[in-house]
């Protein structure tokens, strides 16, 4: 007889979630030449080792420090790119500006970009019906306190002058309880850390609005100044640009600085 | 190396018209997007249309909107000015530029020489 | 539209140091460049992206912006640094300074 599951909001563990897992580890690896001496049977056990027979509301961010010791990682100083709401571009902006990084250009979270997991208490199983929902089920559920470790470890190394991508288009441009606002903002370090310049993105060229000047952007300025951070910020107008550049990165009209 | 030559310059009559080219050469012309730019004698530079790479946007500023029409030929390698409705205050330089830029900033890396219009009865 | 606002002009003595300022409202939130042009030529670029000097530019010139005011910086003039300067930026149309006469005493 199937055993009894709980029934969680949320949609079940990405199929294949092992294999995927240890896939992108092996790719990443091979990619990147200061990560090669990673073995990813060990990156996979630590993973899975954090969510495995546990209670899946009642993960912690201590479960995911086996797995964020292995893949520790450093960014170099100013390279440092975060996002918030516009996660498409960010990544689109770092395959062809080679030398900026996101997290997710990072083994950690590369490895769980998009993924979703969860495991049952007592149990070795992965749970494929269903996980918990932020929302309505719980906050301390495996997918979001990874995030959130993972987060805070990227924001706390980042040096120099730190880069944020905003998404203009947004009735809150700055989000307070957006990963972003509640986690890497606090954890950037100011004897590390310049200043933080944020880029917000504009919808399209014909919006021509100062929205540095949003209420959001001055209630991010006061927090990161407060941390006697420095804080810049850039109306960008052209997503259009970003994108010619993402389809054509050879395109010489694309190389040149930022 | 990056060559921008303007023409069709000359003396034109308030209300008259006058088609401008551009002809680019060193390097790949359907890649970038295209503008002009004039200066009127003893002023400074105001920024007058541009053209996405392909043609398919076209950008103008409030003072020739409606009376200048931007476009471009890709297998000709040519950037054209339309002119129409002239008026005196049109009486300029006008330079072709090619639109550079980061994926942040847009900026003018390469001009042409320019070619004077002049608008007077 | 973002308005900048330049100096007519700037007198400096060769060798010294020339700063040229843009102004506007915020214009730290924007992207600024730098053009040079001399008498019967086009312009030239010298700055962009606020700070960055395209190749072939002498280190003489450099950039900043913050605040209400960009600057474009020409240490140790030379003569052939005498020209008008533009600033020029960008939101959704481009806009330039009025131009500063640059001149060597």
């Known amino acids: 007889l199937p055993r009894w599951r709980q029934q969680w909001s949320g949609s079940g563990t990405t199929s294949r979630f092992p294999e995927t897992v240890l896939a992108r580890c092996v790719k990443y690896t091979e990619v990147h030449p200061e990560m090669r001496h990673v073995d990813c049977q060990s990156v996979w056990d630590a993973f899975k080792g954090a969510f495995i027979s546990k209670y899946p509301c009642n993960i912690t961010e201590e479960d995911y420090q086996p797995l964020v010791k292995l893949g520790t990682q450093t960014v170099p100083c100013n390279k440092t790119l975060l996002w918030s709401r516009i996660k498409d571009l960010a990544h689109q902006f770092t395959q062809v500006q080679r030398d900026m990084f996101t997290l997710e250009d990072m083994l950690l979270g590369y490895l769980a970009d998009d993924l979703t997991w969860c495991g049952e208490f007592n149990t070795f199983e992965i749970n494929y019906q269903s996980c918990p929902d932020w929302r309505k089920d719980c906050s301390n559920n495996p997918v979001s306190v990874f995030w959130k470790t993972v987060s805070r470890r990227f924001a706390e190394t980042a040096c120099g002058v730190v880069h944020v991508m905003l998404n203009g288009s947004r009735s809150k441009i700055f989000d307070k309880n957006s990963t972003f606002g509640s986690v890497e903002v606090h954890n950037l370090q100011p004897e590390k850390v310049q200043a933080l310049e944020a880029w917000v993105i504009h919808g399209g060229r014909e919006d021509s609005r100062d929205l540095c000047q949003d209420p959001t952007i001055k209630e991010l300025e006061s927090i990161i100044s407060k941390r006697n951070i420095r804080f810049f910020c850039k109306n960008i107008y052209r997503p259009d640009k970003f994108l010619q550049c993402v389809k054509n990165p050879e395109d010489s009209s694309c190389l040149s600085g930022i | 190396q990056v060559q921008l030559v303007e023409s069709g310059g000359g003396l034109v009559q308030p209300g008259g018209s006058l088609r401008l080219s551009c002809a680019a050469s060193?390097?790949?012309?359907?890649?970038?997007?295209m503008n002009w730019v004039r200066q009127a004698p003893g002023k400074g530079l105001e920024w007058v249309s541009g053209?996405?790479?392909?043609?398919?946007?076209?950008y103008y500023a409030d003072s020739v909107k409606g009376r200048f029409t931007i476009s471009r030929d890709n297998s000709k390698n040519t950037l054209y000015l339309q002119m129409n409705s002239l008026r005196a205050e049109d009486t300029a330089v006008y330079y072709c530029?090619?639109?550079?830029?980061?994926?942040?900033?847009?900026?003018?890396?390469?001009w042409g020489q320019g070619t004077l219009v002049t608008v007077s009865s | 539209d973002i308005e900048l606002t330049q100096p007519p002009s700037v007198s400096v003595a060769p060798g010294q140091t020339a700063r040229i300022s843009c102004s506007g409202d915020?214009?730290?939130?924007?992207?600024v460049s730098w053009y040079q042009q001399k008498p019967g030529q086009a312009p030239v670029l010298v700055i962009y992206?606020?700070?960055n000097r395209p190749s072939g530019i002498p280190e003489r010139f450099s950039g900043s912006n913050s605040g209400n005011t960009a600057t474009l910086t020409i240490s140790g003039t030379q003569a052939e640094d005498e020209a008008d300067y533009y600033c020029?930026?960008?939101?959704?149309?481009?806009?330039f300074g009025g131009g500063t006469k640059v001149e060597i005493k």
């Open positions: 060193g390097f790949t012309f359907s890649s970038y997007a």
């Open positions: 992206s606020d700070s």
């Open positions: 020029q930026s960008y939101n959704g149309t481009y806009v």
């Open positions: 530029a090619r639109e550079d830029g980061s994926y942040m900033t847009d900026y003018f890396a390469y």
């Open positions: 915020n214009i730290g939130h924007y992207y």
């Open positions: 053209i996405s790479s392909w043609g398919s946007s076209t």
